[in-house]
């Protein structure tokens, strides 16, 4: 799987989960949020070549066109796959609420 | 729907559906396959900023911070979203085989 | 089940060559995609050439003019004549098909280790 445990001890130039901090109030330019003040977002890049987690039929076919057709630009994209939520505090006035936000959080990638 | 109804008629740099027809054994190097000599695949390409078609949550987090920090390279990729399977006629020695390919159509895209 | 089988690896010198062969059996081996896979220590797995049933290749830019990847469908094999080796040709080679019926699925050999030092 194209996750931390593989990802953040390899170097890696193809597709592969890629390290993001964000910041809710400095990269977002949020101040709704109150805890957390950012969390590790992650990421999805790098190439797709032959072979390497193709997604579909599609993806792995489309990988193939590319690397006979090297000039063609038709090729998979590296994107996110496996998704967790991230738990946040915030206010509606003086009241504290309490919500899950649902695929936050970046935990593997595939070639789709 | 970034689905040919919109993308064809549109011309359209953001993140949409593409047309490309492969042609089994010009643009794969593929012999087996009998019957189509190609299909129409198509393919999703194009840029996703703020607002276009996010598929996540996170998609749509990272786009906001790619816009805020247009240094960044993480943003999000304009992938595959509901695809089709492709009915084929291939043969093991003489014998006829008909068998459908799964996902081997695209018929739209979105910002993943 | 497809098995795919591995031979010609070793030690050679800089500037050498060896011949990779790659075995299968099992499956209706002249219709799969075959390739051949590199993974050096540390470093990411690498397509190095694939070829196809109707005989396009391609390769890796850093093996095209020394590489030579070919394929025998009566024989169920398939070859990579490696010459004009580089130390940085180092890893452990893997035979690899890819079957498209019915759904698509991809066998590795247990791979073989070239070694390029002097």
């Known amino acids: 799987a194209l996750d931390a445990a593989y990802c953040f001890r390899n170097v890696q130039d193809n597709c592969c989960l890629r390290p993001l901090y964000i910041d809710f109030k400095r990269d977002l330019g949020w101040k709704w949020i109150h805890e957390p003040k950012g969390y590790n977002a992650n990421f999805c890049a790098g190439a797709c070549p032959y072979l390497w987690s193709s997604d579909t039929q599609h993806s792995r076919v489309l990988s193939l066109y590319n690397t006979i057709n090297p000039e063609a630009s038709a090729s998979p994209c590296c994107v996110s796959q496996d998704l967790e939520p991230l738990t946040i505090l915030y206010y509606i006035g003086k009241t504290p609420k309490i919500e899950q936000l649902s695929n936050m959080i970046v935990k593997s990638c595939k070639c789709s | 729907a970034l689905d040919a109804a919109y993308c064809f008629r549109n011309v359209q740099d953001n993140c949409c559906l593409r047309p490309l027809y492969i042609d089994f054994k010009r643009d794969l190097g593929w012999k087996w396959i009998h019957e189509p000599k190609g299909y129409n695949a198509n393919f999703c390409a194009g840029a996703c900023p703020y607002l276009w078609s996010s598929d996540t949550q996170h998609s749509r987090v990272l786009s906001l911070y790619n816009t805020i920090n247009p240094e960044a390279s993480a943003s999000p990729c304009c992938v595959s979203q509901d695809l089709e399977p492709l009915t084929i006629l291939y043969y093991i020695g003489k014998t006829p085989k008909i068998e459908q390919l799964s996902n081997m159509i695209v018929k739209s895209c979105k910002c993943s | 089940q497809l098995q795919l089988v591995e031979s010609g690896g070793g030690l050679v010198q800089p500037g050498g060559s060896l011949r990779l062969s790659c075995a299968g059996s099992?499956?209706?081996?002249?219709?799969?995609?075959m390739a051949w896979s590199r993974q050096a220590p540390g470093k990411q797995r690498e397509l190095v050439a694939l070829?196809?049933?109707?005989?396009?290749?391609a390769y890796v830019d850093s093996v095209k003019g020394r590489f030579t990847i070919s394929r025998d469908n009566t024989k169920k094999t398939m070859s990579l004549q490696m010459n004009d080796l580089k130390p940085e040709d180092t890893a452990v080679y893997y035979c690899?098909?890819?079957?498209?019926?019915?759904?698509?699925?991809?066998?590795w050999g247990q791979g073989t280790q070239v070694t390029v030092s002097s």
């Open positions: 690899v098909a890819t079957d498209w019926v019915p759904t698509r699925r991809d066998y």
């Open positions: 099992g499956i209706a081996f002249s219709r799969v995609t």
């Open positions: 070829i196809t049933d109707g005989n396009r290749s």
